[in-house]
């Protein structure tokens, strides 16, 4: 059983990478002297208590920064937020912390990240770029929900 986070880099189909700007993750075209974030991810250790066949439930954080992605409602709208949190603290909890969990599904080289707390809502970036990561229900429209995840060993 893996009990340390794996590291990875993410870009979307338009070759934009995730960058941390003022405690917000944004997707921007890769350029020189740019520092894309390195993702930390670890599978939930209570996988048997979550839905089957929806993907691998994972916690998603920013490597070395003690920041994790979470989903919370603002009004009636599920939103994506970065919270100060140790990913291993989430991993070790006695129950799945669903607000911090995502179903990671892979199809070929493409990965999607669906909120466990808000089924049907996916991590996305606007097709325009330079915009914050969001949660969307609109698949394959104005937003990109497919990402390339490359694991770093």
């Amino acid at each position: 059983k893996i009990d340390t986070p794996q590291r990875g880099s993410i870009q979307d189909i338009n070759h934009r990478v995730w960058v941390l700007q003022d405690q917000t993750l944004i997707a921007v075209p890769r350029k020189d002297r740019m520092s894309p974030v390195t993702i930390a991810l670890i599978s939930c250790r209570h996988v048997e208590t979550l839905e089957k066949d929806r993907g691998n439930p994972i916690y998603l954080g920013l490597n070395g920064l003690n920041l994790c992605l979470m989903c919370a409602k603002v009004g009636d709208q599920p939103t994506l937020q970065l919270k100060e949190k140790d990913i291993m603290d989430l991993y070790n909890q006695p129950e799945p912390v669903k607000s911090f969990l995502f179903y990671h599904s892979q199809s070929g080289r493409n990965s999607t990240f669906e909120s466990v707390a808000f089924p049907g809502w996916f991590i996305a970036v606007s097709s325009e770029g330079g915009c914050p990561l969001i949660l969307t229900q609109e698949l394959g429209k104005a937003n990109t929900t497919d990402f390339g995840l490359t694991m770093l060993f």
């Epitope: 209570h46 048997e48 208590t49 979550l50 839905e51 603290d89 070790n92 909890q93 006695p94 129950e95 799945p96 912390v97 669903k98 607000s99 707390a117």
Partner: antibody, heavy 121, light 109 residues
Framework: EVQLQQSGAELVKPGASVKLSCTAS????????IYWVKQRPEQGLEWIGR????????RYDPKFQGKATLTADTSSNTAFLQLSSLTSEDTAVYYC??????????????WGRGTTLTVSS | QAVVTQESALTTSPGETVTLTCRSS?????????ANWVQEKPDHLFTGLIG???NRAPGVPARFSGSLIGDKAALTITGAQTEDEAIYFC?????????FGGGTKLTVL
């Protein structure tokens, strides 16, 4: 105001089954875990198990596997505990409780007032 | 299965500090047991106090604190008040199941 309203006292014959309910108000049970706990007279608490009402997955203490069945109806915001093949050992007060993550930990933050079950012929 | 043991009864006076403990039959209690503390008052009135060993539940007075002392989980009430008279239960996680202690009856005289 958050509340867990439990069904009324039950007097049941040995060998029968009973289904206890726990109806939530002030929050959506899909957003949390509902735990069930047993308390016998002059004894401590025993964890029966828990349900994730959003997806229906359950965990049971091994001692209650086969004795207890946990279900939930999200449309009525209600969790249920069914107990089968009742004996005098099942005479107790049964509590439901919300086990919720807030800030940095899970807590038992709200409890029902319990349902008294008496098994007697 | 693990057995969780608490003092059966303790007595304190208003304003005093009192510590209740929670021992595991399997060895030292650690942060991996995610100790919870729950208060029971008359008429089946339960309140969650502490989760994850030392995290106070929202709305719980600051006089209640959780910790590990030696090989046990502990609940300390600093400056006990008469309304703290109650039964206190600890609960410890063992992998995927939870085990409660027998409870400590705290009298505040």
């Amino acid at each position: 105001e958050v509340q867990l309203q439990q069904s009324g006292a039950e007097l049941v014959k040995p060998g029968a089954s009973v289904k206890l309910s726990c109806t939530a108000s002030g929050f959506n049970i899909k957003d949390t875990y509902i735990y069930w706990v047993k308390q016998r007279p002059e004894q401590g608490l025993e964890w029966i198990g828990r349900i994730d009402p959003a997806i229906g997955t359950t965990r049971y203490d091994p001692k209650f596997q086969g004795k207890a069945t946990l279900t939930a109806d999200t449309s009525s915001n209600t969790a249920f505990l069914q107990l089968s093949s009742l004996t005098s050992e099942d005479t107790a007060v049964y509590y439901c409780a919300r086990y919720d993550y807030s800030g940095s930990s899970f807590y038992f933050d709200y409890w029902g007032r319990g349902t008294t079950l008496t098994v007697s012929s | 299965q693990a057995v969780v043991t608490q003092e059966s009864a303790l007595t304190t006076s208003p304003g005093e500090t009192v510590t209740l403990t929670c021992r595991s039959s399997t060895g030292a209690v650690t942060t991996s047991n995610y100790a919870n503390w729950v208060q029971e008052k008359p008429d089946h009135l339960f309140t969650g106090l502490i989760g994850g060993t030392n995290n106070r539940a929202p709305g719980v007075p600051a006089r209640f604190s959780g910790s590990l002392i030696g090989d046990k989980a502990a609940l300390t009430i600093t400056g006990a008040q008469t309304e703290d008279e109650a039964i206190y239960f600890c609960a410890l996680w063992y992998s995927n199941h939870l085990v409660f202690g027998g409870g400590t009856k705290l009298t505040v005289l």
